[in-house]
């Protein structure tokens, strides 16, 4: 028996369902009574789901997994993982045994989009050219860790005096806070871009500082 999985990682958004595809080629006359199917975590061999003795043995992994029972006899051994969590990320091995056996691993990459950044300024009044100001760009509930870029109004990257911190919450999602310290010119626009490297999703925020009231 030869087991086939997708070579590319499966990307799944947090709280959505994901399908880890796995297939094998049944011989003529194959019956489910002959099938021994195991899904397990590659790195620990922890059992996730199994099908033996002609029966779906069910989920051994937080009761969020399911097979496609009607498709098994055709060689579809794919696994459905419901309500994906950050902690589900990793490699899953599909092991099929009939007369002989084979296995293959598929990677699950979990992702969550970052929120539109909010911008704050300190100090936020009585600003004069030459003042040192701190601009904070905050974006929330994303995964995996973000890449943060700052630019001025002309699109020139600002790399000095930038401090970025990323903190995971209890669900494993990251809140990003990036701080830019800059000396004010006569006026100027400062943009922050928060990029999710897996989703290739960019979230933009900007603040324009003039002699007049601030605009965000």
């Amino acid at each position: 028996v030869e087991v086939q999985v997708s070579e590319d990682p499966v990307v799944a958004l947090v709280d959505t369902d994901a399908t880890l595809r796995c297939s094998f080629s049944p011989e003529p006359g194959f019956s489910l009574a002959q099938l021994n199917l195991i899904w397990q975590l590659t790195d620990t061999k922890q059992l996730v789901h199994s099908f033996t003795e002609g029966r779906d043995q069910g989920s051994a992994y937080s009761n969020r997994t399911a097979l496609f029972p009607d498709l098994l006899v055709q060689g579809n051994a794919s696994l459905r993982l419901q309500r994906v969590r950050v902690t589900d990320e990793g490699s899953y091995t599909c092991f099929v045994s009939i007369q002989d056996f084979d296995s293959a691993a598929v990677s699950l990459q979990v992702a969550a989009p970052y929120s539109k950044p909010s911008m704050t300024l300190e100090p936020n009044k009585d600003l004069r050219p030459g003042n040192m100001v701190t601009i904070t760009c905050s974006s929330y509930q994303g995964y995996p860790e973000a890449e943060v870029f700052w630019k001025d109004g002309q699109g020139v990257p600002l790399t000095g005096n930038v401090t970025t911190s990323q903190m995971a919450n209890e669900r494993g999602l990251f809140d990003v806070h990036s701080v830019l310290r800059v000396v004010l010119g006569a006026n100027g626009t400062y943009s922050c871009l928060v990029r999710n490297p897996v989703l290739q999703q960019d979230a933009h925020g900007s603040v324009t500082i003039t002699g007049q009231p601030l605009t965000f």
Partner: antibody, heavy 118, light 109 residues
Framework: EVQLLESGGGLVQPGGSLRLSCAAS????????MSWVRQAPGKGLEWVSG????????YYADSVKGRFTISRDNSKNTLYLQMNSLRAEDTAVYYC???????????WGQGTTVTVSS | QSVLTQPPSASGTPGQRVTISCSGS????????VNWYQQLPGTAPKLLIS??QRPSGVPDRFSGSKSGTSASLAITGLQSEDEADYYC???????????FGGGTKLTVL
């Protein structure tokens, strides 16, 4: 040729320590889980410990938990078993074995003898 | 007390067929590969059969089968050099441990 070669066995007093090594050759060591299995004189085979290919996951038999530590150095193609607080009942031939993706210990070393006695 | 149960001994005459049984549970043999090892006196164990698959170099006189939570090893055309200890083994995903049978000493009469 696929080969596993154990070393480090010997005579040690109860409460003492010993470190076993298993040198692997002829295959991509870093791609395989590995195990230690022992056999007391005149007795059957007893699994001792296992470790994942990267070393991130380790498992132990209840009889050695907290006393033995399995580790590996993939750059040196070597598996280790650090044995502390040794007891007379740890006296055995210790084998290292390759543990493949199909849950088969398919290649075994020739074994190294550990004797715990005062 | 071993997790997998094997008869302690078996015997046969040259040319005969002998079988050795191994009984386990759903968390080991029931869904995991069952392996059979031959250990000749004074040597390391050697893989003989996995489920019903023979590694290259193992004579086709040796065969394995598995049904439910039990497995068996059959040896046909018994030869004097088959006299050895035979062990079944499987990964147990409830115990997170390899489990072995107590071993069966095969005597060729």
């Amino acid at each position: 040729e696929v080969q596993l070669l154990e070393s480090g066995g010997g005579l040690v007093q109860p409460g003492g320590s010993l470190r076993l090594s298993c040198a692997a050759s002829g295959f991509t060591f870093s791609s395989y889980w590995m195990s230690w299995v022992r056999q007391a004189p005149g007795k059957g085979l007893e699994w001792v410990s296992g470790i994942s290919s990267s070393g991130s996951a380790t498992y132990y038999a209840d009889s050695v938990k907290g006393r033995f530590t399995i580790s590996r150095d993939n750059s040196k193609n070597t598996l280790y078993l650090q044995m502390n607080s040794l007891r007379a009942e740890d006296t055995a031939v210790y084998y290292c074995a390759r543990w493949n993706d199909y849950d088969i210990m398919d290649v075994w070393g020739q074994g190294t003898t550990v004797t715990v006695s005062s | 007390q071993s997790v997998l149960t094997q008869p302690p001994s078996a015997s046969g005459t040259p040319g005969q067929r002998v079988t050795i049984s191994c009984s386990g549970s759903s968390s080991n043999i029931g869904r995991r590969t069952v392996n059979w090892y031959q250990q000749l006196p004074g040597t390391a164990p050697k893989l003989l059969i996995s489920n019903s698959q023979r590694p290259s170099g193992v004579p086709d006189r040796f065969s394995g089968s598995k049904s439910g939570t039990s497995a068996s090893l059959a040896i046909t055309g018994l030869q004097s050099e088959d006299e050895a200890d035979y062990y079944c083994a499987s990964w147990d995903d409830s115990l997170n441990a390899w489990v072995f049978g107590g071993g069966t000493k095969l005597t060729v009469l």
